[in-house]
Amino acid sequence: PEPPTACREKQYLINSQCCSLCQPGQKLVSDCTEFTETECLPCGESEFLDTWNRETHCHQHKYCDPNLGLRVQQKGTSETDTICTCEEGWHCTSEACESCVLHRSCSPGFGVKQIATGVSDTICEPCPVGFFSNVSSAFEKCHPWTSCETKDLVVQQAGTNKTDVVCGPQDRLRA
């Protein structure tokens, strides 16, 4: 547009002046005036601002509380917040990862479809026909039933979603 219909993208309006915003990693000390430029100062240790801003205070870096099962995945900078993740075997309860819970195990009859990560829980799926899981596990997939035929054996007991088939020798008395 010509002429401009607003301050430019990295500016804000104050007292009839379009002043420069402070860049990420810096906070506003004083607005620009007719005589002076915007004054910005770098954020302190353990503080950050991640956008062009006119904030007078920087945000504190997130604390990854080990008592909640948290640990630092990525240390914060003056422009980015600390990223927390969970200890091994645990995952975040929310996107913000403010606390952790133990990975869920898949009960017998269910297998692991997707192994849990620091941010997502275990995904279980029911074992379909021909597969079983006889343990409660956060890692085990459904296993296929044993193929008695390939061992030259016959099915003595049918498998279920929780148990394998039982194979036995062929009945030699049969014709």
Epitope: E2, R8, E9, K10, S16, C22, T38
Partner: antibody, heavy 125, light 107 residues
């Protein structure tokens, strides 16, 4: 204090290119648009275009379209103007200038509040 | 393109004189006009923006007025340091053109 310091004088042959730099200090470089204006010897001022230092997006005066390239390097707070296929009538002092915007009576009024010292480009065979 | 015509092109005056420079636009530009002062071998210096607002640090003897197509720059009492060339600039539509300049000389 705000300063715009330009590169030194250049002598070029017709058909060549020239690249003039403008180093900004004393303010947040990416916060203000940068303009280029030239002045032929003994003549008036001619607006060439501008660059948004944040995005790097330029806008050129139609007269220079296809011959001028405006760029910037935010890491060193420097804007550049390159003019190609130089002719003798491109002999001029080239200035960078910072845009300021004033708001009054419901409108936004631009002007150029700080200027570089100028770079003389002489095109001669 | 919008044409800006300054008058006069040359002006001889004495220290203490009241000086008026006119800038006419070929079409209406509201108050999107700035005035600059340039001394030989130097970059232009902003005096007035938005047709009538004085830039900080500029002496109050400089004033601007007008809107639409007719604008004036007035120096109420000319000082030795005011001998220079003055340019108007329209910032209403691209390209943001300048007037041809008015040279103020010592009489």
């Amino acid at each position: 204090q705000v300063q715009l310091v330009q590169s030194g004088a250049e002598v070029k042959k017709p058909g060549a290119s020239v690249k003039v730099s403008c180093k900004a200090s004393g303010y947040t470089f990416a916060g203000y648009y940068m303009y280029w204006v030239r002045q032929a010897p003994g003549q008036g001022l001619e607006w060439m275009g501008w660059i948004n230092p944040d995005s790097g997006a330029p806008t050129y005066a139609q007269k220079f379209q296809g011959r001028v390239t405006m760029t910037r390097d935010t890491s060193i707070s420097t804007a550049y103007m390159e003019l190609s296929r130089l002719r003798s009538d491109d002999t001029a002092v080239y200035y960078c200038a910072r845009e300021k915007i004033y708001y009054g009576s419901g409108n936004y009024y631009p002007s150029f509040d700080y200027w570089g010292q100028g770079t003389l480009v002489t095109v001669s065979s | 393109d919008i044409q800006l015509t300054q008058s006069p092109s040359f002006l001889s005056a004495s220290v203490g004189d009241r000086v008026t420079i006119t800038c006419r636009a070929s079409q209406g530009i509201s108050s999107y006009l700035a005035w600059y002062q340039q001394k030989p071998g130097k970059a232009p210096k902003l005096l007035i923006y938005a047709a009538s607002t004085l830039q900080s640090g500029v002496p109050s003897r400089f004033s601007g007025s007008g809107s639409g197509t007719e604008f004036t720059l007035t120096i109420s009492s000319l000082q030795p340091e005011d001998f220079a060339t003055y340019y108007c600039q329209q910032l209403d539509s691209y390209p943001w053109t300048f007037g041809q300049g008015t040279k103020v000389e010592i009489k």
